[in-house]
């Protein structure tokens, strides 16, 4: 009987045309939404005149569908086994699962003015990005309507830069009509130990924004994972998003809708300093911000953003060192509301609930020769938002899968 | 020691065009920024435009109408200022200088070359 | 655009004097005034540099203070060779803007 259900198993989680794997992989049954909180800063003035702590205040969640769309340009390769295909993005924006609208206005750190003074750190170069966002009254804190800090404004300081530059900013721009990848993962029709095991990404098994193993493409997206999960095992995936590989590890045993599911979270370890887990090594990019590698829970993502100081941490800088979160009051960490944890069907190896969670922050340094940044006297990793993006089996699918799959075998 | 070198200038008429080098013999010539700057009869000197080392990002005060270019060749360790539209004011000795690697302005200066503008 | 006011126009001092030039910045430019001496017939030498810095090789008489928009250059003991046009240049922010000068003559 075993035997029987592994083989049914082993076919139908092959990502071929035909399979329930296929089906639920080009475009996912389950709705997938992303919520996000963003940190509307209560004392701009303090900050930039007194280098003061800043007093953040979260506001949210404002909700997003997300994942929507089928992947596009779905292509198999006979020969090596492997699926290729882009992932499009979009978002719509759900008014009654939000706290208010895209028209809600937030006090913000200048995005541009951040990244502009972190990329040009030549004095010379400094004192002419100074005239212009003089000139143009923009200062080292903003107000933006939801909307544009997510999906991108036209920056007034930006443009009156008299060179080709990209003038409009915003975390998330470009993402409607925009797709990640190429990704190429392979179908696991010679070897379902492979599947969905990604081989390729934007045509290479390397990201070039890291040292050594760090830089290496692990795993698999995290919507699936090879079939027969062991509690043992460490789940390996590569997420876009923050531009690397990353990890989760067993936790406990949870029923999802009557079936059986391992929760998989993403352990402190994985965002520990070299320090404490030297595996970690290759992630320390810079040794000043870092505090010579021993400062953690904060990944400096620059190199895979054209050099803006971006760095991702886990919401509210849960698992980061008391320094990244000393200079911003006002944040509560806690493992329930802010890790990430993903919840597999072992058999199958399925994700069917998941809540991924992370934040985004910016970096702004003290610039002698930037007046609006001139008072600062210290670096800050500044939380922008956090996002918490989550989905769950529908009841319908979940009765399927029970009566299908975990019903057979129990 | 740097040396800057400079040439091109002259007497010239109002309206005409005039094309400033200033050569220098440092090895390290692209990672400098460099910068035109001028001293009048009245002995004002004024900055007339500024390059940063690869040539990418130029600078021109407001006071100078962008009637002037500022350009560089870094493989031939040459700094330009192409000037046209000339006007009497703007007779002037022009120098070219180098800003110090910490960003300081003007570090070191050439000997300058004389433009007469004048009818 | 920051203005800057030098004083005085010209100034004959004997050999021995101490020298004072001041430079008055219209708008608050930290330590970031730099000071040039200009000998006739040649360009003009960096002496000071921002951050009241006297630039290696340039004797100790000179000196500099100040801070905000209140600066003063100073030559403790005049030497002939001393000789030369002064000019203060504020490079806080652009456009930079120079002093219109001091012309130092031997009494």
């Known amino acids: 009987g075993d035997l029987l259900i592994q083989k049914t198993i082993k076919k139908q989680v092959v990502l071929e045309e035909g399979t329930i794997a296929f089906k639920n992989w080009v475009k996912t049954g389950t709705e997938v939404y992303r919520q996000f909180w963003i940190f509307d800063v209560q004392n701009p003035q303090e900050v930039m005149m007194n280098s003061s702590n800043i007093q953040v205040k979260q506001r949210g969640p404002y909700t997003y569908r997300v994942r929507f769309l089928a992947k596009e340009n779905v292509t198999q390769d006979a020969e090596d086994n492997t699926v290729s295909f882009l992932q499009p993005n979009g978002a719509i924006f759900e008014p009654s699962l939000s706290v208010g609208t895209e028209a809600d206005n937030f006090t913000v750190l200048n995005l541009a003015v951040a990244a502009a003074s972190h990329i040009y750190q030549n004095q010379f170069v400094q004192m002419i990005l100074n005239s212009l966002i003089n000139k143009s009254k923009s200062s080292m804190f903003q107000v933006r309507t939801l909307r544009e800090l997510l999906w991108g404004y036209r920056d007034p300081f930006l443009s009156l830069v008299p060179y080709p530059v990209t003038t409009t900013v915003g975390l998330f721009y470009p993402y409607n009509n925009t797709a990640d990848g190429v990704y190429k993962v392979f179908n696991g029709k010679d070897n379902i130990s492979k599947v969905a095991i990604i081989d390729t990404y934007k045509g290479k098994r390397n990201l070039s924004y890291w040292e050594s193993h760090c830089d290496m493409i692990n795993g698999t997206d995290a919507a699936s994972f090879p079939p027969f999960v062991e509690k043992s095992q460490v789940l390996q995936f590569f997420s876009s998003d923050i531009c690397r590989s990353i990890y989760a590890v067993f936790e406990s045993d949870v029923n999802l809708k009557g079936i059986p599911v391992y929760r998989f979270v993403l352990p402190s370890k994985a965002f520990a300093s070299p320090v404490e887990n030297p595996d970690n090594y290759c992630f320390c990019t810079e040794k000043i911000i870092s505090k010579n590698c021993t400062s953690y829970g904060v990944l400096d993502i620059s190199k895979c953003k054209e050099g803006r100081p971006v760095y991702i941490s886990l919401p509210h800088f849960l698992y980061a060192s008391p320094d990244v979160s000393e200079p911003i009051d006002g944040l509560n960490p806690n493992e329930e509301e802010h890790r990430t944890y993903l919840d597999i069907e072992p058999i199958t190896g399925f994700t069917l609930q998941f809540a991924k969670r992370l934040q985004v922050n910016l970096l702004v340094k003290p610039s002698e020769k930037i007046q609006v940044l001139k008072n600062l006297k210290r670096n800050y990793i500044v939380p922008i938002l956090w996002l918490n993006e989550t989905g769950t089996i529908g009841d319908e699918k979940a009765n399927m899968f029970r009566s299908q799959v975990t019903g057979k075998i129990n | 020691e740097v040396q800057l070198v400079e040439s091109g200038g002259g007497v010239v008429q109002p309206g005409e065009s005039l094309k400033l080098s200033c050569e220098s013999n440092?090895?390290?010539?692209?990672?400098?920024?460099m910068s035109w700057v001028r001293k009048t009869p009245e002995r004002r000197l004024e900055l007339v435009a500024a390059i940063n080392s690869d040539g990418a990002i130029t600078y021109y005060p407001d006071t100078m109408e962008r009637r002037f270019i500022i350009s560089r060749d870094n493989t031939k360790k040459t700094l330009y200022l192409q000037m046209s539209s000339l006007k009497s004011e703007d007779t002037a000795m022009y120098y070219c200088a180098r800003h110090g690697q910490t960003g300081t302005w003007f570090a070191y200066w050439g000997q300058g070359t004389l433009v007469t503008v004048s009818a | 655009e920051t203005t800057v006011t030098q004083s005085p126009a010209s100034l004959s001092m004997a050999i021995g004097e101490k020298v004072t030039i001041r430079c008055i910045t219209s708008?608050?430019?930290?330590?970031?005034m730099n000071w040039y001496q200009q000998k006739p017939g040649e360009p003009p030498k960096l002496l000071i540099s921002?951050?009241?810095t006297l630039r290696p090789g340039v004797p100790s008489r000179f000196s500099s203070s100040g801070y905000g928009t209140d600066f003063v250059f100073t030559i403790e003991n005049m030497l002939s060779e001393d000789v030369a046009d002064y000019y203060c240049l504020q490079s806080d922010n652009l456009p930079l803007t120079f002093g219109a000068g001091t012309k130092l003559e031997l009494k």
């Open positions: 708008t608050d430019i930290d330590d970031d």
């Open positions: 921002e951050g009241n």
């Open positions: 440092e090895y390290e010539f692209p990672s400098h920024d």
